[in-house]
């Protein structure tokens, strides 16, 4: 570590005095101190002498000696006071710039340590400091305003009490800059705009920042628009607003609008699209198939997307039949707005009953007219089966009727013994009926088919079973011949309740 002679931390001299500061180190050494006149520097290998033969108050300051080659970077310092009765202050800088919440050092150095007890910091023209100004003083360095605020950007003077009167330093201008976290915050409203040719429109682009130094512009496609800027300051933010007012829109006004704001931190931009149309429009669509099939007892949500301008004047869901004149309960109809011009309407149909199959229509109206979108809802049912014994054209025939949706397939089984249902071990014969006769097939109803099995002789210790199945489930009916006559047996599980 270098050594300074004289080996005292502070040296007090009078104006005009000769001052010699010598620094010695292992290698070459360098002096660093306040920029002041009259110093001469003499270096000789490992020592360096700083001297003046006419010290002035401007030489007041801390002089530091460093050894550039020292890996530990050690240094030694001495503080020189040149106590001038007429000049209690040596101001090293007349402008200090800091960011908010940093400590601001106002470098007015006291030229006489004895005066320390009577120092104070004031604003120019004797005005007191602003409330909540937290500051401290060091005779070596000056006044420090702690955690400086933007509002403390003022002109200050350092005051010392000399012989009962206050003597001021020259003024120091403090500039406290706002910490700009990034580019200005932006809003562009609306996010999307549709207008009919000839209508009025308004697009508002606004930007705000803690600092007033930022630019904002509104751009259409690639053209920067000339819009008078409105400026404001509230909530501690500067706001600049550009309002594009169009009295009568035309097709050339359509396109992409970008709100762009920039400051030293960079640029932000946000965009919206403006559509100009010839006339009102109303479009209905659904992501679902308009023909829906649902198993009875289950639920279904019907969804319609609406794109419209101007807004809807009316809308509703209607049941068009064919079963009853019931209408969907309003509480089951739900509307959500995706954005200004797009909406989704949902009709919830929980635990569907047979009477709720049919056509459901969503109707909407705006100045462009009426539009409707109709869903066809068919319910799926598992088959219901019944078997009877009859004679057709003199032949004994088992007649199986199966009813369900989708159309059931029919299979006959003959098995040994009397049973409610044939199992594999008992099966003697299986007949598939690929083309059962369709007895009824109306929209939204079950399909009823009939299958005939001609039996020349009924075997009494056997069971004849008609099985029907579709994509929903299956049903069966066992027919057991008895000597006294035929006996039919529906299986227990057929007791079906939708």
């Amino acid at each position: 570590i270098p050594v300074i002679e004289p080996s005292v931390p502070e040296l007090v001299v009078k104006p005009g005095a000769t001052v010699t500061l010598r620094c010695v180190g292992n290698g070459s050494v360098e002096w660093d101190g306040p920029p002041s006149p009259h110093w001469t520097l003499y270096s000789d290998g490992s020592s360096s002498i700083l001297s003046t033969n006419n010290a002035t108050f401007q030489n007041t300051g801390t002089y530091r000696c460093t050894e550039p080659g020292d890996p530990l970077g050690g240094s030694a310092a001495i503080h020189l006071y040149v106590k001038d009765p007429a000049r209690p202050w040596n101001v090293l800088a007349q402008e200090v710039v800091v960011f908010e919440d940093q400590d601001a050092l106002l470098p007015c150095l006291l030229t006489d340590p004895v005066l320390e007890a009577g120092v104070s910091l004031v604003r120019v023209r004797g005005r007191p400091l602003m409330r909540h100004t937290n500051y401290s003083f060091s005779p070596w360095h000056g006044f420090t305003i702690h955690r400086a605020k933007f509002i403390q950007s003022q002109d200050y003077q350092c005051s010392a009490l000399m012989g009962g009167r206050k003597v001021m330093s020259i003024s120091i201008r403090l500039k406290v800059q706002k910490v700009i976290p990034g580019p200005p915050a932006l809003t562009l409203v609306p996010a999307e705009l549709v207008r009919i040719r000839g209508e009025a429109a308004q697009i508002v682009c606004s930007a705000s920042s803690v600092d007033v130094n930022f630019d904002v512009f509104l751009q259409h496609n690639n053209t920067k628009l000339a819009i008078p800027q409105q400026s404001d300051f509230h909530n501690n933010r500067y706001q600049k607003v550009l309002t594009l007012n169009l009295d009568q829109v035309d097709f050339q006004h359509a396109g992409n609008y970008s709100c762009v704001a920039s400051n030293v931190q960079g640029k932000h931009s946000t965009s919206m699209f403006f559509r100009v149309v010839e006339s009102a429009y109303l479009n209905l669509s659904s992501e679902q198939n308009l023909i829906q099939e649902v198993t009875v007892g289950e639920g279904l949500n019907l969804k319609v997307m609406v794109e419209a301008y101007p807004g809807l004047q009316g809308f509703n869901w209607t049941y068009l039949g064919p079963f009853s004149d019931h209408q969907p309960e309003p509480k089951l109809a739900n509307a959500t707005t995706k954005d200004t011009y797009r909406h989704t309407f949902t009709l919830s149909l929980p635990r569907l009953k047979p009477s709720e199959a049919g056509r459901y229509s969503f109707l909407a109206r705006n100045p462009g007219g009426w539009r409707a979108l109709t869903f066809e809802l068919t319910l799926r049912y598992p088959p219901e089966v019944s078997v009877i014994w009859t004679f057709i054209n003199g032949s004994g025939t088992l007649l199986c009727a199966a009813s369900g949706y989708p159309q059931p397939n029919v299979t006959w089984l003959q098995c040994s013994g009397h049973t409610d249902r044939c199992d594999e071990a008992q099966v003697l014969q299986v007949w598939d009926d690929p083309y059962p006769e369709v007895l009824s097939q109306e929209p939204f109803h079950k399909v009823t088919v009939q299958s005939l099995l001609t039996v020349e002789t009924l075997e009494h210790n056997q069971t004849y079973e008609c099985r029907a199945h579709n994509s929903v489930g299956s049903g069966s009916w066992a027919f057991i011949p008895i000597s006294a006559g035929a006996h039919t047996h529906p299986p227990d599980e057929f007791l079906f309740t939708p």
């Epitope: 509104l218 690639n222 053209t223 000339a226 819009i227 800027q229 409105q230 400026s231 007012n245």
Partner: antibody, heavy 118, light 113 residues
Framework: QVQLVQSGAEVKKPGASVKVSCKAS????????MHWVRQAPGQGLEWMGR????????YYAQKFQGRVTMTRDTSISTAYVELSRLRSDDTAVYYC???????????WGQGTLVTVSS | DIVMTQTPLSLPVTPGEPASISCRSS????????????LDWYLQKPGQSPQLLIY???YRASGVPDRFSGSGSGTDFTLKISRVEAEDVGVYYC?????????FGQGTKLEIK
Amino acid sequence: QVQLVQSGAEVKKPGASVKVSCKASGYTFTGYYMHWVRQAPGQGLEWMGRINPNSGGTYYAQKFQGRVTMTRDTSISTAYVELSRLRSDDTAVYYCARKNPWGHFDYWGQGTLVTVSS
Amino acid sequence: DIVMTQTPLSLPVTPGEPASISCRSSQSLLDSDDGNTYLDWYLQKPGQSPQLLIYTLSYRASGVPDRFSGSGSGTDFTLKISRVEAEDVGVYYCMQRIEFPYTFGQGTKLEIK
């Protein structure tokens, strides 16, 4: 519909001042810059400057600096141009023109003839 | 200031015939940032205020017949009338607005032969 209606003709002596008004209607006055253009008899068009009706900020052509003042009163949607120290070569028709956001002058006042004569 | 020079200063035309007015600027009116050329054309009919014909080089103003067209690039510009009609008489001005002060050409007087 958009209209810019200017004040009537003026006759002034050299050295005097004149103030011409331009009342806007049919649109949002503060949403468009207002420019002033003049035309000496039998001559071409000459741009004088513009005012931001929002802030009152102005920009004047160098030729008129120090002699021209553009102001506005947003409460009555009116823009004004005042020209001082009039000379005979200031005799002209003075027009106000609304600047469309796309930059061109889409609406013009009917013009105000200012005659400077001793 | 940017100087705008129009030619011819007078243009006698027979109705139904085409007409062409030239305008030259002392520096480029092309904005390299957005690619637009900031030149407009105005028509001042006798006894009337000027009215906009063409803006930003080639865009026709609302209500302007399609017989009017603007073209050009950089410093040389042209206003064309495909078939002159009697109502087209007046003085045509080009104007630059790429920078302040805005400046106009001297005007071209179109008259019917």
